[in-house]
């Protein structure tokens, strides 16, 4: 089941999946002036069996000089600010990631790929947040979000992370005002079935990972 929305946006933070659950799709998008080749894949799909997962299809871009159907509008400053959490992050592979069953690694970049990636996540996907450069984290809990299915609808849990500017006078984590969870109720206040596949595995995996994976960018 695809998640309805993107993970929540946290001011001054970016999110990253360490691994992608089977069923995840990645748009084949090309940078400005390029388009998908006519017979090329529309998206990549994480597929596999119990022992191995990989991305089906390959994205390929070609010059769109003949017909400008895939132009990519340069975002305005406010749009760039909005999109910062989903711009491409590091393709580095933490070693733990390879051993997580039913998941794919970050796909390598392809030639003339767009500067932003759009993933279509599935229920059970976990993403991790980190403050952008120049901001520091005030944690009240895990800096992660999970796509869950509740009452037949998908939603992302609210990451417990606040990013504050280093120059700002900030409160201690214990003094923060609690943030309302999505849909205005505490996470625990639900009486129906919650899909929790792989949550524990991923949480344990995340605990061992270095945060440096967020800091490298595509060359």
């Amino acid at each position: 089941e695809l998640c309805d929305d993107d993970p929540p946006e946290i001011p001054h933070a970016t999110f990253k999946a360490m691994a992608y659950k089977e069923g995840t799709m990645l748009n084949c998008e090309c940078k400005r002036g390029f388009r998908r080749i006519k017979s090329g894949s529309l998206y990549m799909l994480c597929t596999g069996n119990s022992s191995h997962s990989s991305w089906d299809n390959q994205c390929q871009c070609t010059s769109s000089a003949t017909r400008n159907t895939t132009k990519q509008v340069t975002p305005q400053p406010e749009e760039q600010k909005e999109r910062k959490t989903t711009e491409m992050q590091s393709p580095m592979q933490p070693v733990d990631q390879a051993s997580l069953p039913g998941h794919c690694r970050e796909p390598p970049p392809w030639e003339n790929e767009a500067t932003e990636r759009i993933y279509h996540f599935v229920v059970g996907q976990m993403v991790y947040y980190q403050c952008v450069q120049g901001y520091r984290a005030l944690h009240r809990g895990p800096a992660e979000s999970v796509c869950k299915m509740t009452h037949g609808k998908t939603r992302w849990t609210q990451p417990q992370l606040i990013c504050t500017g280093e120059m700002e006078t900030s409160q201690f984590p214990g003094e923060e005002k609690p943030q309302a969870s999505p849909e205005g109720r505490p996470e625990s206040e639900t009486s129906c079935l919650v899909t929790t596949t792989d949550f524990q595995i991923q949480t344990e995996m995340a605990a061992t990972m270095e945060t440096s994976i967020f800091t490298t960018e595509y060359q």
């Epitope: 695809l2 309805d4 929305d5 993107d6 799709m25 990645l26 748009n27 084949c28 998008e29 090309c30 388009r35 998908r36 529309l42 998206y43 159907t69 895939t70 132009k71 990519q72 509008v73 989903t86 767009a114 932003e116 759009i118 993933y119 279509h120």
Partner: nanobody
């Protein structure tokens, strides 16, 4: 509540152009494609074109050389520029929104539909 509202339909002569618009509201459409379909009397609903947030596009072979889809993300609108119209283009044109990447989604599987706008091309 997601709403898709089409506009721009009407009666035109063969060879003319028409530009349809669709205003989408009620959610973020970043991970949704916006698409156009049409349904002629007595026929099934037919996929025409789709576009992603990053403006990657896909067209049905039947309209690729004459129709152009475009998207205005800040305004949450999608347009369909239809050139060199033919009488066989006469149909009700529907705007659609669907989760996932650009692909020719079968009509029964589409997440959200507009009400449709009539396009009539006379010879």
């Amino acid at each position: 509540q997601v709403q898709l509202q089409e506009s721009g339909g009407g009666l035109v002569q063969a060879g003319d152009s028409l530009r349809l618009s669709c205003a989408a509201s009620g959610r973020s459409f970043r991970n949704y494609i916006l698409a156009w379909y049409r349904q002629a009397p007595g026929k099934e609903r037919e996929f025409l074109a789709a576009i992603s947030w990053l403006e990657g596009t896909l067209y049905a072979d039947s309209v690729e050389d004459r129709f152009t889809i475009s998207r205005d993300n800040p305004k949450n609108t999608v347009h369909l520029q239809m050139d060199s119209l033919k009488p066989e283009d006469t149909a009700v044109y529907y705007c659609a929104a669907d989760r996932g990447p650009v692909r020719p989604v079968l009509a029964p599987d589409v997440d959200y539909w507009g009400q449709g706008t009539q396009v009539t091309v006379s010879s």
